[in-house]
């Protein structure tokens, strides 16, 4: 089951994928493309790399991570709900059936409206009490129970709490990391 | 206009060898992934053997491995599939395909027939 | 290795009707499904892939859908050229494994 990422209608998409080379430098080529991954390569590729470089990129996709280092993380930039879907980033690794394949699920939700001070009991009342943050499996949901009367100034403190205590493990330990060499 | 023509088909006897080829036109053969789908007469389509760009990976289906090798030459714009060891159960029309996963570009087959 | 059921076996359909063939597996394969159409002694061509994306000069009669375990290719309108034998393909396990067909002859 592939493992669900989130993001809202203007930001920048974040699909994480790592490796570790087996040698600083001794890159391993990665392809990253719209749809689950097939048997062999990528469908619709939108970014790959070779032994040295990037070498085939389309706009608004880019790696912003040091893929040198095996940071192959996939970026969209200024997501549409058109982006939605299941993206493959496949590791090439020399030999038969070598491949790791990872499919990622991107979930486009549309941008939030922020509420007039009026209102805020309204979005109170119809604001689900949960927040879905990036995990070890597919979208790990966070249940804040029964909280009678939050707020948006502590959901985005809840937030940035459960972004800032996991995202460096999140990120990480996504499921697409592997070890070469 | 791409094209792609299969050739060395013909009546073999049971256990004896083939080698089919299959020259390329009309786009970057070096740049394609190149595959081996066979259909037998009357059947449907199995695929049998790929190859990758550079002749690096090589991947058959478990019925004709050890028996079947699939090659390339670049240079030549060039596929080949040497059969050794034939099988009645090998007879068969063998398309050579452009693609990996699915094919885009086939030609138009030889018949190859192992009976005694 | 992973079968490929396609149904009906065959279909009776008169020039002009509508033509709606299934294939039909048993996990999930996304979107990575193909549908060829091929003619008595001729060799097969590629229509749609991505379960939906028609091929290079594929008229828009032809549409593909579904994803995960259950597909669909619809002709709109036969044509007296569509008479002809369907195949799906999937590619998203390995080996790579086609449907049965499915024989579309004229009503």
């Known amino acids: 089951s592939e493992v669900e990422y989130r993001a809202e209608v203007g930001q920048n998409a974040y699909l994480p994928c790592f490796y570790t080379p087996a040698a600083p430098g001794n890159l391993v080529p990665v392809c990253w493309g719209k749809g689950a991954c097939p048997v062999f390569e990528c469908g619709n590729v939108v970014l790959r790399t070779d032994e040295r470089d990037v070498n085939y990129w389309t706009s608004r996709y880019w790696l912003n991570g040091d893929f040198r280092k095996g940071d192959v993380s996939l970026t969209i930039e200024n997501v549409t709900l058109a982006d939605s879907g299941i993206y493959c980033c496949r590791i090439q690794i020399p030999g038969i059936m070598n491949d790791e394949k990872f499919n990622l699920k991107l979930v486009i939700k549309p941008a939030k409206v922020t509420p007039a001070p009026t209102r805020q009991r309204d979005f109170t009342a119809a604001f689900p009490r949960m927040l879905t943050t990036r995990g070890h499996g597919p979208a790990e949901t966070q249940t804040l129970g029964s909280l009678p009367d939050i707020n948006l100034t502590q959901i985005s403190t809840l937030a940035n709490e459960l972004r800032d205590s996991r995202l460096a493990n999140d990120l990480r330990d996504s499921g697409a990391t592997i070890r070469i060499g | 206009e791409v094209q792609l023509v299969e050739s060395g088909g013909g009546l073999v006897q049971p256990g004896g060898s083939l080698r089919l080829s299959c020259a390329a036109s009309?786009?970057?053969?070096?740049?394609?992934?190149m595959t081996w789908v066979r259909q037998a007469p009357g059947k449907g389509l199995e695929w049998v053997a790929n190859i990758k760009q550079a002749g690096t990976e090589k991947y058959y289906v478990d019925s004709v491995k050890g028996r079947f090798t699939i090659s390339r030459d670049n240079a030549k714009n060039s596929l080949y599939l040497q059969m050794n060891s034939l099988r009645a159960e090998d007879t068969a029309v063998y398309y050579c395909?452009?693609?990996?996963?699915?094919?885009?570009?086939w030609g138009q087959g030889t018949l190859v027939t192992v009976s005694s | 290795e992973i079968v490929m059921t396609q149904s009906p076996a065959t279909l009776s359909v008169s020039p002009g009707e509508r033509a709606t063939l299934s294939c039909r597996a048993r996990q999930n394969f996304y979107s990575n499904l193909a549908w060829y159409q091929q003619k008595p002694g001729q060799a097969p061509r590629l229509l749609i892939y991505?379960?939906?994306t028609r091929a290079t000069g594929i008229p828009a009669r032809f549409s593909g859908s579904g994803s995960g375990t259950e597909f669909t290719l619809t002709i709109s309108s036969l044509q007296s050229e569509d008479f002809a034998v369907y195949y799906c393909?999937?590619?998203?396990?390995?080996?790579?494994?086609f449907g049965g067909g499915t024989k579309v002859e004229i009503k």
């Open positions: 009309g786009f970057t053969f070096s740049n394609s992934w």
């Open positions: 991505g379960a939906s």
């Open positions: 395909n452009s693609g990996s996963n699915y094919f885009d570009y």
């Open positions: 393909q999937q590619y998203n396990n390995w080996p790579l494994t």
